[in-house]
C-alpha cells in the first residue's frame, strides 16, 4: 500500500545502499561499489538519483526500472 504522508517516515532505501533526501519527497540512492550483479529490487518510486557505478551489472533488461517515475 502507499505510505502515509509524513515528514518523519523514511523513504525505502535498498539494503547496503546509502540514501539521502532530495527535497521534500525525493531520495538520492548510492549503491556504488557493492558488488551487485543485478539492480536492487526495492527502489523507492521517489528515487531521483541512482548510482550503480563500480558494480558487476553486465546487462539491463528493457525498462529495468518500471516503478520509477
Amino acid at each position: 500500500g502507499s505510505s502515509p504522508r509524513s515528514g518523519v517516515l523514511l523513504r525505502g532505501c535498498p539494503t547496503h545502499c546509502h540514501c539521502e533526501p532530495d527535497g521534500r519527497m525525493l531520495l538520492r540512492v548510492d549503491c556504488s561499489d557493492l558488488g551487485l550483479s543485478e539492480l536492487p529490487s526495492n527502489l523507492s518510486v521517489f528515487t531521483s538519483y541512482l548510482d550503480l557505478s563500480m558494480n558487476n551489472i553486465s546487462q539491463l533488461l528493457p525498462n529495468p526500472l518500471p516503478s520509477l517515475r
Partner: antibody
C-alpha cells in the same frame, strides 16, 4: 542559522490545558514539517505528532488523539502544541523539532510542563 | 506500534575505547533507522539517518550498520565529548518510536 525557540516552563493543575509555542527562524518555515516529542523525567523520547506548515496537515500518535492539537501561524513562523485534560503523567519536557524526509535535524531547547495539584 | 529495544541501557567506557550500541526492532524496519545524541541541557542532535548516513558535521568515528530488525551504532574511538545518551528511532511506520536510550558514561 536554524533556530527553534520554545516558550517558557509551565505549571498546570490536573484537568487543565497547556499550549506550548515554538518559533522557527533561519529557514523557510513551510518547507519543513514540525515534530513534537516529549520526555518524561528520567525516561526516553515519545513522539506526539507532526504538522506540515504548508497546509496544516497533521498526524498524531493515537495515544494522544483527542487530547492534542497541533497548529501553526505561518505569518510568524510559529508552531503550537496544545495538550488538554492534563494528568500527572503528562509532566515532561516537550520538544519541537523540524524534519524533512524522515529525520529530525534540528530540535528546540525544550519546554518543561509540570502537572501538579 | 513497533517496539525498539536498545542495549545496553548504560555503558561505562574510557576515552579511546571502541563502543557498540545495538537496537532491535519488533519487526523489519527496512533500514529506516536514525540515531540521536542527547546531552544534559543541550538540544538533541541527529547523528545518523537511513541506518548509515552520517549527518553533516558528525565526526567519522560514528558509524551505523545493520538490516532487518537489528542495527548498531559504533563509535570507533571514544572522545570526551561523546559521553551522552544515545537513542535509536525507527522511521518505518507511524507512530515513529524510539529506543529506551543508552547512557554512555566515563569509566
Amino acid at each position: 542559522q536554524v533556530q527553534l525557540v520554545q516558550s517558557g516552563a509551565e505549571v498546570k493543575k490536573p484537568g487543565a490545558s497547556v499550549k506550548v509555542s515554538c518559533k522557527a527562524s533561519g529557514y523557510t518555515f513551510t518547507n519543513y514539517w514540525m515534530q513534537w516529542v516529549r520526555q518524561a523525567p528520567g525516561q526516553g523520547l515519545e513522539w506526539i505528532g507532526e504538522i506540515d506548515p504548508s497546509d496544516s496537515y497533521t498526524n498524531y500518535n493515537q495515544k494522544f488523539q483527542g487530547r492534542v492539537t497541533l497548529t501553526v501561524d505561518t505569518s510568524t513562523s510559529t508552531a503550537y502544541m496544545e495538550l488538554s485534560s492534563l494528568r500527572s503523567e503528562d509532566t515532561a519536557v516537550y520538544y519541537c523539532a523540524r524534519s524533512l524526509s524522515g529525520y529530525v535535524d534540528y530540535w528546540g531547547q525544550g519546554t518543561t510542563v509540570t502537572v501538579s495539584s | 506500534d513497533i517496539q525498539m529495544t536498545q542495549s545496553p541501557s548504560s555503558l561505562s567506557a574510557s576515552v579511546g575505547d571502541r563502543v557498540t550500541i545495538t537496537c532491535r526492532a519488533s519487526q523489519d524496519i527496512s533500514n529506516r533507522l536514525n540515531w540521536y545524541q542527547q546531552k544534559p541541557g543541550k538540544a538533541v542532535k541527529l547523528l545518523i539517518s537511513y541506518r548509515s548516513r552520517l549527518h553533516s558535521g558528525v565526526p567519522s568515528r560514528f558509524s551505523g550498520s545493520g538490516s532487518g530488525t537489528d542495527y548498531t551504532l559504533t563509535i570507533s574511538s571514544l572522545q570526551p565529548e561523546d559521553f551522552a545518551t544515545y537513542y535509536c528511532q525507527q522511521g518505518n511506520s507511524l507512530p515513529p518510536t524510539f529506543g529506551g536510550g543508552t547512557k554512555l558514561e566515563i569509566k
